[in-house]
């Protein structure tokens, strides 16, 4: 039979960011590879990474068409170096993913604080919006286009002489934060969907930026 | 094609409870943020409140908060209005309407709306 | 909250004729991230529930006549009708959709003349 000795895909994991979406899975191939399928509930199969011996498949293309939909994948596996036959009727061992919804399960990606400015005893720290591979008319959406008001950003930020750590929020890309004249301070930012009850409702946090280097600028 | 249909006109007494309903179809109902409009006789639009029923989140108004809830059922694709003890102002149409596709991009689909009179 | 604030409350028109409405937002709507204006511009028509025609203070909604087009930036912003049609009386409502609570505008009367 055309499929005999082939394992059926197993472990289907979604891994997302930014909705930069990869389907992986197990085992590593041993003669055989897989092609996998993706659809939405209502729509059709369509088939991506044919033939492959890898144990993963970008599908961002596919899902970035409607983020706010569902989708399902399926991973079949064949015998290697099968070669697709119109008189094979026997379908071939598959296995199917969890349902994947990339608007309330895609991952925020690390943000970055792109600049920091302060005037007398105020601090602008600005985040960097993100660009995403979500289209609208042939342009890229940011993170912002995409989740609007249902992201914000939480600034952490503390002297750089104590560990006292100190917050602010934002539905904007920007904090206007009051500070100490004469003390250098240290930031941090971390996306957050609030509206996510789940592990993913948080990015990890920026990387640290301190007064006193190159990022910032001081006008009295 | 994507609709949003209310439930029927309600006439009630004050101090009654009430919950109006709207059924979403036609779209992926758990990612698309449902919202409550409030509309008196002869006057403007009230922005209520919202629910994203795929998490429960949900916004009030502070100027509704503690008299109305919204919920959601996200098995029957269906959100909420409830109050738990009308008053006479509470008497309006009451609108639900599905955002827009994009951040912020307005309430893209609308209900016909419910009546609700509040009369003893 | 954000106020908004529209003008005039009542707009009669010659069909044909262009229409202007403006509305102010008691803070800026513009978004710092990605430089978009959440403004929304809604029509409603007599006995109708609202319909929406503008988002982003400027993008069309998708079936909106292209005779109606949106303005502005910050807190000033307006909706202009090219040539008015019959089919255009109603109540037309700005909001702000930057931030809780959303926000609408009292509302402007387009009547025909």
């Known amino acids: 039979s055309g499929t005999t000795n082939t394992v059926a895909a197993y472990n289907l994991t979604w891994k997302s960011t930014n909705f930069k979406t990869i389907l992986e899975w197990e085992p590593k191939p041993i003669n055989q590879v897989y092609t996998v399928q993706i659809s939405t509930k209502s729509g059709d199969w369509k088939s991506k990474c044919f033939y492959t011996a890898d144990t993963e498949c970008d599908l961002t293309d596919e899902i970035v068409k409607d983020v706010k939909q569902t989708y399902l994948a399926r991973v079949f596996s064949y015998p290697a170096g099968h070669v697709e036959s119109t008189g094979s009727t026997e379908e071939p061992p598959y296995e199917n993913s969890p349902e994947f919804t990339p608007y309330l399960e895609t991952n925020l990606g690390q943000p970055t604080i792109q600049s920091f400015e302060q005037v007398g005893t105020k601090v602008n720290v600005t985040v960097q919006d993100e660009w995403t591979l979500v289209r609208r008319n042939d342009t890229f959406l940011s993170l912002r286009d995409v989740f609007g008001k249902d992201l914000i950003y939480t600034l952490y930020y503390w002297k750089s002489s104590s560990s006292g750590k100190k917050t602010a929020k934002t539905n904007t890309n920007e904090f206007l934060i009051d500070v100490d004249k004469g003390e250098n301070y240290c930031f941090s930012v971390q996306a957050v969907i609030p509206s996510r009850r789940t592990a993913n409702r948080k990015s990890t946090d920026s990387p640290v930026e301190c007064m006193g280097h190159e990022k910032g600028e001081s006008r009295e | 094609e994507v609709q949003l249909v209310q439930s029927g006109a309600e006439v009630k007494k004050p101090g009654e409870s009430l919950r109006i309903s709207c059924k979403g179809s036609?779209?992926?109902?758990?990612?698309?943020?449902i919202e409550w409009v409030r509309q008196m006789p002869g006057k403007g639009l009230e922005w209520m409140g919202d629910i994203l029923p795929g998490s429960g989140s949900t916004n009030y108004n502070e100027n509704f908060k503690g008299h109305v809830t919204i919920s959601a059922d996200k098995s029957i694709s269906t959100a909420y209005l409830q109050w738990s003890s009308l008053k006479a102002s509470d008497t309006a149409m009451y609108y639900c309407?599905?955002?827009?596709?994009?951040?912020?991009?307005?309430?893209?689909?609308w209900g016909q709306g419910t009546l609700v009179t509040v009369s003893s | 909250d954000i106020v908004m604030t529209q003008s005039p409350l009542s707009l009669p028109v010659t069909p044909g004729e262009p229409a202007s409405i403006s509305c102010k937002s008691s803070q800026s709507l513009l978004s710092s991230g990605n430089q978009k204006n959440y403004l929304t511009w809604y029509l409603q028509k007599p006995g109708q529930s609202p319909q929406l025609l503008i988002y982003?203070?400027?993008t069309r909604e998708s079936g909106v006549p292209d005779r109606f087009s949106g303005s502005g930036s910050g807190t000033d912003f307006t909706l202009k009708i090219s040539r008015v049609e019959a089919e255009d009386v109603g109540v037309y409502y700005c909001q702000n959709d930057y931030t809780y609570p959303l926000t609408f505008g009292q509302g402007t009367k387009l009547e025909i003349k």
């Open positions: 309407a599905r955002s827009g596709y994009y951040g912020n991009s307005g309430f893209a689909y």
């Open positions: 982003w203070a400027s």
């Open positions: 036609g779209y992926t109902f758990i990612t698309y943020w």
